[in-house]
């Protein structure tokens, strides 16, 4: 059986939309499937790599690599999107291309970044971990770390940094899929909202879905002990 909830929820474009949340009900009137997984149920994607989930994550990453920061022209906010999802009239799509990106490092101004921009994250403004020396962030936003400390400046002069961020990674469903969403939408969908991250590639949704002990390698499920737990 399914339990359907409908509610008006704030979405990425800053408007309220009617959203449906469909929950598979437990036939035996007990915990939900997500709770059962958290409690240690035999859920194979938590025990070993699941090809379907792996393909989903790779597809999400490929899309994210090509994303940019969509900044609303009315200063109402910004969100990481694909160019096609960013209004040409109501917003500005900030994407580094044609030599407009910042240099990879101050030692070589000529080598410019082509991957980005990312809403609220920039190698020029992140102090920790700083993109410098042997630890220069790659020219691939899906390999960027989470910035834990921004430069102490209320304004950077960068459109994608000075805007009010409207969406962050949200882990939805038992398949460990990730979407950049508003906190309201994420909570309504019973997802896990990552306040600390800016990109889906920075979070490991399956690790969150599975719970219990974190995977040794966040990309590789290793909870073999589930076989004895349930």
């Amino acid at each position: 059986a399914q339990h359907v909830t409908t509610q008006l929820v704030l979405r990425n474009k800053g408007v309220y939309e009617s959203v449906k949340y469909i929950q598979q009900e437990n036939f035996w009137i007990g915990p939900s499937s997500i709770d059962l997984i958290h409690l240690g149920a035999k859920f194979s994607p938590c025990i070993r790599k699941d090809q379907q989930i792996e393909q989903l994550v790779l597809r999400e990453r490929d899309l994210e690599r090509d994303s940019g920061c969509c900044v609303q022209n009315d200063h109402s906010g910004c969100i990481q999107t694909q160019r096609k999802d960013c209004s040409e009239t109501l917003a500005t799509f900030v994407k580094w291309q044609d030599d407009t990106g910042p240099p990879m490092d101050k030692s070589d101004l000529g080598q410019k970044r082509t991957s980005g921009a990312v809403c609220h994250q920039d190698p020029r403004t992140c102090e920790e971990p700083a993109s410098s020396g042997a630890h220069i962030w790659p020219d691939d936003i899906t390999k960027w770390p989470i910035c834990t400390e921004q430069a102490k400046s209320n304004r950077t002069g960068f459109l994608h940094m000075d805007c009010q961020i409207k969406g962050r990674p949200c882990c939805i469903s038992t398949k460990g899929s990730c979407e950049i969403t508003t906190r309201e939408y994420c909570e309504f969908m019973h997802g896990y909202f990552h306040e600390e991250a800016t990109l889906c590639s920075q979070v490991h949704c399956l690790d969150k879905v599975c719970g219990l002990l974190p995977f040794l390698n966040p990309e590789v499920p290793d909870q073999f002990y589930r076989l004895w737990l349930s």
Epitope: D98, D99, T100, G101, P103, K106, S107, D108, L109, G110, K112, R124, T125, E127, A130, S132, A151, K152, T156, G157, F158
Partner: antibody, heavy 120, light 107 residues
Framework: QVTLRESGPALVKPTQTLTLTCTFS??????????VGWIRQPPGKALEWLAH???????YYNPALKSRLTISKDTSKNQVVLTITNMDPVDTATYYC????????????WGQGTLVTVSS | EIVMTQSPDFQSVTPKEKVTITCRAS??????LHWYQQKPDASPKLLIK???QSISGVPSRFSGSGSGTDFTLTINSLEAEDAATYFC?????????FGQGTKLEIK
């Protein structure tokens, strides 16, 4: 507010070494993404970038003058010092110190400049 | 090094006129170009960064455009206080280099 002030001799003899000091306030040279450097302008001519020193001690010099230039900083005193060896009359110019940022590698604040004449 | 060439070297204009100053780079520099204003006996002041981005406190009559090798600084409705020399600067690669300057005289 941010201010920078250059100081040093107004007159130096050929072959001598010039030492210029930039004293700044309103920011710290230990602040991420900031640097202070030197630009000169011969009378009636264009600006020429000489050198910069960054918050993390990185130093960059104009290759055409690199062998003659040394830049250093004293963060506690809010000072940056530039030395130019083997001065020549063609080095006669107004020397400016300016703040630079890795945000765009442009100079957002400048000192008022100090005119240095090289003559025997 | 990248050579920056400005034109014209000198321009005499009347107040309220629209002025355009061009800057050409010896190679493509994307949008890594900044404009400065230097009034007589004063130090330079940053006007425009990244070819077209305005700087807070700079009058809106100043605007910039261009990318690649050709750039333009436009002053809409010139005012007497705009008499100055204008320089462009590239930050595409070390060493940072400037144009030779365009001197603007108000008639």
């Amino acid at each position: 507010q941010v201010t920078l002030r250059e100081s040093g001799p107004a007159l130096v003899k050929p072959t001598q070494t010039l030492t210029l000091t930039c004293t700044f306030s309103g920011f710290s040279l230990s602040t991420f993404a900031l640097g202070v450097g030197w630009i000169r302008q011969p009378p009636g001519k264009a600006l020429e970038w000489l050198a910069h020193i960054w918050w993390d001690e990185d130093k960059y010099y104009n290759p055409a003058l690199k062998s003659r230039l040394t830049i250093s900083k004293d963060t506690s005193k809010n000072q940056v010092v530039l030395t130019i060896t083997n001065m020549d009359p063609v080095d006669t110019a107004t020397y400016y110190c300016a703040r630079i940022t890795t945000y765009y590698y442009g100079m957002d604040y400048w000192g008022q400049g100090t005119l240095v004449t090289v003559s025997s | 090094e990248i050579v920056m060439t400005q034109s014209p070297d000198f321009q005499s204009v009347t107040p309220k006129e629209k002025v355009t100053i061009t800057c050409r780079a010896s190679q493509s520099i994307g949008n890594h170009l900044h404009w400065y204003q230097q009034k007589p006996d004063a130090s330079p002041k940053l006007l425009i960064k990244y070819a077209s981005q305005s700087i807070s406190g700079v009058p809106s009559r100043f605007s910039g455009s261009g990318s690649g090798t050709d750039f333009t600084l436009t002053i809409n409705s010139l005012e007497a206080e705009d008499a100055a020399t204008y320089f462009c600067q590239q930050s595409y690669q070390w060493p940072l280099t400037f144009g030779q300057g365009t001197k603007l005289e108000i008639k």
